[in-house]
């Protein structure tokens, strides 16, 4: 039951990546607006994009705060220009989304190479640490931060001219690899959490090839 | 649900050509790279190679002059061809899928013996 | 290429008793390293990856440890079902397998 002519949100769902996270939902609205409230199992409601027409509501700063909680959020229906008005029952509709653990749940971002660089035989790629949104004592935390060991990336590397391909793994953000000497190399990086089931994989990165401004080439 | 199976001839003559099939179900080649493991008898696993999702490859050096891995992505199956078999090739061979940080599933596995 | 080094190559354990694996590489493989269970059958699963996390399904006595170079695998309750041989594997190019340990009941 509700006021006549607005309707309850429903398809809540969560979109996060590197912990960046909006709750959306549907429908557009006709003649009613939302406000969003947010929680942790044992906390109080937060409210968020009061009164708003918009069918998302950016919720990074609330989660950041612990990304490890477990957050529940709602979405309330109102009359548009009357927004005090409620249900039958003496309150606005409101649906529940599912609940949100940010860390264990958050996308990973496509990683990027931030450089290489070639010694003789071995080449040192270095894979970019990208920036969160998570704080710690007024800073903002990067990926690694965050994750710790529980983050590796996969690095894939292979011959420009050959239809072999290789691999290499860490737990930090840098690879050592052994290569040819006089071949160009192509790298893609991928980034991974072990210990998840779900949303355990990053896209891979762009691919960067030997050759290209990106990488150094040393004669030792 | 995910499987995996292999199948080919249980038996090669020397210096003949194997070739082993892998059939794979509930996941696309696509998305997961398939590896083959080989386990001669009485010897641990050995890794022979693995097809990568974009469909390129890597091959255990010792093997690489007579391995080839392909597949064939709308069949979801991945193909092993390996020449000049010996004695010492009789093991039991098996297709795994690759999650990354381990080989999650495993096919049952195809015993072949080399033998005139 | 990073080699593998296990042992014991075989033990024999009573029901009940913990039973420790031990698996070394020959470099720093960044905890980048899983445990296989093979049985007679010719079956083979996925026991642990990178180092510590259970794959799904393994009852909970199967646990992982280490870092660097050194790695073990312990299963804290030895089971009659645990009757097999045990691998650790390395996960770079190319990978590589230690040489088993075949635990048998005492």
């Known amino acids: 039951s509700g006021t006549t002519n607005t309707v309850a949100a429903y398809n809540l769902t969560w979109k996060s990546t590197n912990f960046k996270t909006i709750l959306e939902w549907e429908p557009k609205p006709v003649n009613q607006v939302y406000t969003v409230q947010i929680s942790t199992k044992s906390g109080d409601w937060k409210s968020k994009c009061f009164y708003t027409t918009d069918t998302e509501c950016d919720l990074t700063d609330e989660i950041v705060k612990d990304v490890k909680q477990t957050y529940l959020a709602r979405v309330f229906s109102y009359p548009a220009g009357n927004v005090e008005s409620t249900g039958s029952a003496g309150e606005p509709l409101y649906e529940n989304s599912p609940e949100f653990t940010p860390y264990l749940e958050t996308n990973l971002g496509q990683p990027t190479i931030q450089s290489f660089e070639q010694v003789g035989t071995k080449v040192n790629v270095t894979v970019e640490d990208e920036r969160t949104l998570v704080r710690r004592n007024n800073t903002f935390l990067s990926l690694r931060d965050v994750f710790g060991k529980d983050l590796i990336y996969t690095l894939y590397y292979w011959k420009s001219s050959s239809s072999g391909k290789k691999t290499a793994k860490t737990n930090t953000n840098e690879f050592l690899i052994d290569v040819d000497k006089g071949e160009n190399y192509c790298f893609s990086v991928q980034a991974v959490i072990p210990s998840r089931t779900v949303n355990r994989k990053s896209t891979d990165s762009p691919v960067e090839c030997m050759g290209q401004e990106k990488g150094e080439f040393r004669e030792i | 649900q995910v499987q995996l199976k292999e199948s080919g001839p249980g038996l090669v003559q020397p210096s003949q050509t194997l070739s082993l099939t892998c059939i794979v179900s509930g996941f696309s080649l696509t998305n997961y790279n398939v590896h083959w493991v080989r386990q001669p008898a009485g010897a641990g696993l050995e890794w022979m190679g693995v097809i990568w999702t974009d469909g390129k490859t890597d091959y255990n050096s010792t093997l690489q002059s007579r391995l080839s891995i392909s597949r064939d992505t709308s069949k979801s199956q991945v193909f092993l061809k390996m020449n000049s078999l010996q004695a010492e090739d009789i093991a039991t061979y098996y297709c795994?899928?690759?999650?990354?940080?381990?080989?999650?599933?495993w096919g049952q596995g195809v015993m072949v013996t080399v033998s005139s | 290429d990073i080699k593998m080094t296990q042992s014991p190559s075989s033990l024999s354990a009573s029901l009940g008793e913990r039973v420790t694996i031990s698996c070394r590489a020959s470099e720093n493989i960044n905890n980048i390293l899983a445990w296989y269970q093979k049985k007679e059958d010719g079956s083979v699963k996925l026991l642990i990856h990178y180092t510590s996390n259970l794959q799904s399904g393994v009852p909970s006595r199967f646990s992982g440890s280490g870092s660097g170079k050194d790695y073990s695998l312990t299963i804290s309750g030895l089971e009659s079902e645990d009757i097999a041989t045990y691998y650790c594997?390395?996960?770079?190019?190319?990978?590589?397998f230690g040489a088993g340990t075949k635990l048998e009941l005492k």
């Open positions: 795994a899928r690759d999650w990354d940080t381990g080989f999650d599933y």
């Open positions: 594997q390395q996960a770079y190019t190319p990978y590589a």
